[in-house]
Amino acid sequence: KETAFVEVVLFESSPSGDYTTYTTGLTGRFSRAGATLSAEGEIVQMHPLGLCNNNDEEDLYEYGWVGVVKLEQPELDPKPCLTVLGKAKRAVQRGATAVIFDVSENPEAIDQLNQGSEDPLKRPVVYVKGADAIKLMNIVNKQKVARARIQHRPPRQPTEYFDM
């Protein structure tokens, strides 16, 4: 089982116009639905239903972002427009360099993602749960600029900061 080491850097601007960066480390898993690769990009939070729209004009983001999707309890969406695998695929089609799923509310999605090994995506599809998911969503929900770096080995110490 491949651990995904995720560094999330939150950028907060001060009144003087400078950026203060806050780095948080968390771990997830590379699913068999995607590649075990490093990836980096600005975090874009996506609602599961937001991936349903098949409109090509929906490509609002440049290539190279990291999609973060908090999956809901399956009972809340009993007839989903896309499977979890389909949602990962749609995000990558729209330019995501990686997709991170919070599976805390829908842990069965772990098995769904690992059934994607017959035709895996060429980008990483990572899942997080528990305390790591809480940390990630706390940052994402601040709705400030944040970047994620996904690595398949522990990040070097001291933490390297992103070149903006």
Partner: antibody, heavy 117, light 110 residues
Framework: QVQLKESGPGLVQPSQTLSLTCTVS????????VHWVRQHSGKSLEWMGR???????SYNSAFTSRLSISRDTSKSQVFLKMNSLQTEDTGTYYC???????????WGQGVMVTVSS | QFVLTQSNSVSTNLGSTVKLSCERS????????VNWYQQYEGRSPTTMIY?????PDGVPDRFSGSIDRSSNSVLLTINNVQTEDEADYFC?????????FGGGTKLTVL
């Protein structure tokens, strides 16, 4: 086609350890969860625990302290180990599969285990 | 943690319609999927209904699942009951990484 088959001793001494093996075919352990469920002779079914497609495990809190589930993906086998057996652990033990939804789509044939001296 | 309660035994006539119930003790019955399994004497259980009302391939359409919110229960309805329907029926749900079974109902066909 999908198959699961349990194997192990039919008789175990009280206070000893139960070791069961579930050999699967027709699917990959790295894509599906395998669970252990037991059934007392009095009919009731009891979920014991599972090993997820990624190798993580979850256990029924009633068994946490004495149950261990592991696997060997190269042999397509899942193992159950439960220690400190008592007579009330007598029953039929099933391994079964789930695959992304919270229900069991395939069951093994079951193995009858009697705990007695 | 909730409990699923089923009647211990139910008898019905050949060709009739029977409803087997599975009541959830606490929490909304619709909050977590409920599934139904059939088990013949000395055999392994097989799935009859999953996700409240979905029927796997090979299960006769005489079998259907539904939710009865007034009693916080799920129902397994068997129409035109046949002798081969005589078996034990178990409901099952889940909650936070834990799978929960009802005690089972023995269906006797007269």
């Amino acid at each position: 086609q999908v198959q699961l088959k349990e194997s192990g001793p039919g008789l175990v001494q009280p206070s000893q350890t139960l070791s069961l093996t579930c050999t699967v075919s027709g699917f990959s352990l790295t894509s599906y969860s395998v669970h252990w469920v037991r059934q007392h002779s009095g009919k009731s079914l009891e979920w014991m625990g599972r090993i997820w497609s990624d190798g993580d495990t979850s256990y029924n809190s009633a068994f946490t302290s004495r149950l261990s589930i592991s696997r060997d993906t190269s042999k397509s086998q899942v193992f159950l180990k439960m220690n400190s057996l008592q007579t009330e652990d007598t029953g039929t033990y099933y391994c079964d599969r789930s695959g992304g939804s919270p229900f069991f789509d395939y069951w093994g044939q079951g193995v009858m285990v009697t705990v007695s001296s | 943690q909730f409990v699923l309660t089923q009647s211990n035994s139910v008898s019905t006539n050949l060709g009739s319609t029977v409803k087997l119930s599975c009541e959830r003790s606490i929490g909304n019955i619709g909050s977590n999927y409920v599934n139904w399994y059939q088990q013949y004497e000395g055999r392994s259980p097989t799935t009859m209904i999953y996700k409240f009302d979905q029927r796997p391939d090979g299960v006769p359409d005489r079998f259907s699942g539904s939710i009865d919110r007034s009693s916080n229960s799920v129902l397994l309805t068997i129409n035109n009951v046949q002798t081969e329907d005589e078996a034990d029926y178990f409901c099952q749900s889940y909650s936070s990484d834990m799978y929960i079974f009802g005690g089972g109902t023995k269906l006797t066909v007269l």
